[in-house]
């Protein structure tokens, strides 16, 4: 139990005010009313309150809300929401975008800390899915977020979300992320037409199967290197080199470059060597001529 | 079961002191705010006093400053309110109330008990 | 201190009739710190509403809460014979805790 001192005469705070920076961390514990302290939360991130201060007001809102703030006060936490626990932030109920803005506004510029992220996924949860707006919210604070989901988490993800995704959103998520996401980047920017809907997709394009690639090959794209790059391996094997050369475009040349980095390596393995000459390039490593190509995947698949 | 039960009323001469108990039970005593809340014959409620639970922050209506005190004893689930310098007007009920402070409203109420300050 | 003003002091209505009581503070109180309470004689106040909207449990939905900044409404939409009562508002934004004096609602 908190030893309890008696708040000494004339010292009892009416309100949230400057007076208390000269405040000991006893007096503030017996002189400030939670309940007031509550009421005037938009008043503590203007006063200049030490952290050992900011201890004792997060300890009066735990005595006033032992189940978890309510979200009047979360709103208004500014930095003392950096004194709160994940097990603090788990007691919460976030539902508005605005409170969730202005608690990230306080870590911004520092990396996604255990608190930040313990209260987007209590936010998320709230939601049941990451719309548009909150996505658009994350990513603007961090770039970063999307790739940090599971795929299980990044199939919530509706397609109309998708629209609010920014290239460099994508830069850190693996093949298995992209896998969930691009099927939803496809029906979201399905009815926009042939050059415009490249470049929506591109950065989604980890995620493509084959017969899209083979779709996209027929529409001059002009691929560049760096997404070709990112392409599965396995969609990008049973790509022709005249698929290729169509997907690439001019950007074709920059195979020489990658040719020993997969999927380029992996793919120039699979090609005739006569095909490969075609384009000039002097790849190396196709199949010679005259030797006969078993897939063996459609032979297991057959028996 | 929320139920809170007060006791100590009576009849007292001005000046004189009395000590009013609130035995709560059916909920965390040691997690509530709570109130005192009188009501002077054929009047209406007046807000008294409350305290908090953990460091027994106290707050008090003008009327009853430096003559009444709250206290609590979180071992007991009781609430007190001391009230010394008893004058003609502190005559009323006073009711002990829980503050629920997620609805910021005293969300129970005790039945009250009946102070009178007469010679 | 945030004063409370009840009006009317007296309401004088049938059963089946709708009630409108208002209250007014002395200054803007945040809708989450004003209440709502009933007072039958004899008895102690019961919670009607709290967050100047919210109905507490166990009260019927004929009771609903409206208002913010300095104006706040308790509305019955039709009077029930058990609801001939005082009733109270309340704010828990500043020390002390002030009620309005209330307002009667007797039958007519």
């Known amino acids: 139990e908190v030893e309890k001192t008696a708040c000494p005469s004339g010292k009892k705070a009416r309100e949230i005010d400057e007076s208390l920076i000269f405040y000991k961390k006893w007096e503030l514990e017996a002189c400030v009313d939670a309940a007031l302290l509550a009421t005037q939360m938009d008043r503590v991130n203007a006063i200049p309150f030490t952290y050992e201060q900011l201890d004792v007001l997060k300890h009066k809102l735990d005595e006033l809300y032992p189940q978890g703030y309510p979200e009047s006060v979360i709103q208004h936490l500014g930095y003392l929401f950096l004194k709160m626990s994940p097990e603090d932030i788990r007691k919460w109920n976030v539902t508005s975008l605005e409170t969730l803005k202005a608690l990230l506004e306080v870590n911004k510029g520092h990396e996604m800390s255990p608190q930040v992220a313990t209260l987007i996924d209590r936010f998320v949860k709230g939601r049941g899915q990451l719309d548009k707006d909150t996505l658009d919210t994350l990513t603007a604070f961090y770039p970063g977020y999307l790739c940090s989901l599971s795929p299980e988490e990044l199939s919530s993800v509706p397609p109309s979300s998708i629209w609010a995704v920014r290239p460099q959103d994508l830069d850190t998520c693996d093949p298995r992320q992209l896998d969930v996401l691009y099927p939803k980047a496809r029906l979201a920017f399905q009815n926009m037409n042939g050059s415009e809907y490249f470049v929506k997709i591109q950065s989604f394009l980890g995620g493509a199967p084959t017969e899209d690639l083979k779709a996209l090959s027929q529409q001059n794209v002009s691929m560049d290197l760096a997404t070709f790059m990112k392409l599965r391996t396995d969609a990008v094997l049973p790509l022709t080199v005249a698929e290729v050369q169509k997907l690439l475009g001019p950007h074709v040349e920059g195979l020489k470059a990658e040719e020993r980095h997969r999927p380029v390596r992996d793919w120039i393995l699979r090609q005739r060597q006569d095909d490969l000459d075609t384009l000039g390039l002097g790849l190396q490593g196709g199949i010679p001529n005259g030797y006969l190509v078993l897939d063996l995947s459609m032979q297991e698949a057959l028996s | 079961e929320v139920q809170l039960l007060e006791s100590g009323g009576g009849l007292v001469q001005p000046g004189g002191s009395l000590r009013l108990s609130c035995a709560a039970s059916g909920f965390t005593f040691t997690h509530t705010y709570m109130s005192w809340v009188r009501q002077a014959p054929g009047k209406g409620l007046e807000w008294v006093s409350n305290i908090s639970p953990t460091y027994s922050t106290t707050n008090y209506a003008d009327s009853v400053k430096g003559r009444f005190t709250i206290s609590r004893d979180n071992n007991k689930n009781t609430l007190y309110l001391q009230m010394n310098s008893l004058r003609a007007e502190d005559t009323a009920v006073y009711y002990c109330?829980?503050?629920?402070?997620?609805?910021?409203?005293?969300?129970?109420w005790g039945q009250g008990t009946l102070v009178t300050v007469s010679s | 201190e945030i004063v409370l003003t009840q009006s009317p002091g007296t309401l004088s209505l049938s059963p089946g009739e709708r009630a409108t009581l208002s209250c007014r503070a002395s200054q803007s109180v945040s809708s989450s710190y004003l209440a709502w309470y009933q007072q039958k004689p004899g008895q102690a106040p019961r919670l009607l509403i709290y967050g100047a909207s919210s109905r507490a449990t166990g009260i019927p939905d004929r009771f609903s809460g409206s208002g913010s900044g300095t104006d706040f409404t308790l509305t019955i939409s039709r009077l029930e014979p058990e609801d001939f009562a005082v009733y109270y508002c309340q704010q828990a934004l500043g020390y002390p805790h002030t009620f309005g004096q209330g307002t009667k609602v007797e039958i007519k």
């Open positions: 109330a829980r503050y629920n402070a997620y609805h910021a409203a005293l969300d129970y």
